[in-house]
Amino acid sequence: CKAMHVAQPAVVLASSRGIASFVCEYASPGKATEVRVTVLRQADSQVTEVCAATYMMGNELTFLDDSICTGTSSGNQVNLTIQGLRAMDTGLYICKVELMYPPPYYLGIGNGTQIYVIDPEPCPDSDF
């Protein structure tokens, strides 16, 4: 297993609709054809997997149908979007990139993106 540098923004504010997008960029040492991207969430020293996708270079990322993540790739960059976020989901989201094929296997873990999520103010009742 060889180490690889992964860069991501330090802090991002999700939209009022609970959507956060950020770029995860990795310094690929070779010409990988198969890449796996995993988003991990760290909160109170507990790490959980948010979503993961394996893709072939030049193809779209395919997450599971019920995943809260979507993404696109361009060269050594992955544009990740996480949706359905609530204030309680505020935390550190870490991008993990694995170059699966061809060998050698490379692993890179970013420093994490702090995603802040603000629940929208409830609309005041209105009379019609």
């Epitope: 923004p9 802090v11 991002v12 504010l13 760290q42 420093n111 994490g112 702090q114 802040y116």
Partner: antibody, heavy 121, light 108 residues
Amino acid sequence: QVQLVQSGAEVKKPGASVKVSCKASGYTFTSYGINWVRQAPGQGLEWMGWISAYNGNTNYAQKLQGRVTMTTDTSTSTAYMELRSLRSDDTAVYYCARLYCSGGSCYSDYWGQGTLVTVSS
Amino acid sequence: EIVLTQSPGTLSLSPGERATLSCRASQSVSSSYLAWYQQKPGQAPRLLIYGASSRATGIPDRFSGSGSGTDFTLTISRLEPEDFAVYYCQQYGSSPFTFGPGTKVDIK
């Protein structure tokens, strides 16, 4: 080295608007956020809101909602805070501060020098 | 919104004495998101402590922070003349990123 340099003092009449700038240097501007904080004469610090320089999304203090707008110009690494419909109790020193996050910890590590805004008829 | 209460409002001490400042939150705050600032007249605030207990770059080791949940403490082990100032806590756990009202440390 990281620096935040703010625009100069302003004197405004009640009902007018003011726009304070905060030019950042020494770091990757879009990686972090910018907090705006104000301090009325002899009073404590009041958080006004923040902007994510990465995507331009904003979060404002409820009491200022509708009167304040925070923006960034990533081409010049500058953040702006505009406050409208000024009142005498908006007289304060306005600070910008970098919102830094690392390893799950967030705080304002670098501050601008402050901009005095005086609202007087 | 999380309300931060600081006590005492004013602390009158002599150089060389120990200062203990309290910051209490109305609801639990992760220690990762609690910071302390020092402010002197006519100056911008200066970061002292982040993550409840980590000293910022260049801050002398006489300053220390502790606490978790709703109770946090800033301790100055031996007051130096330059330490007489106002101290604020701030939380970044949830918006709004509220400040405490401050504790003024002045010379007795």
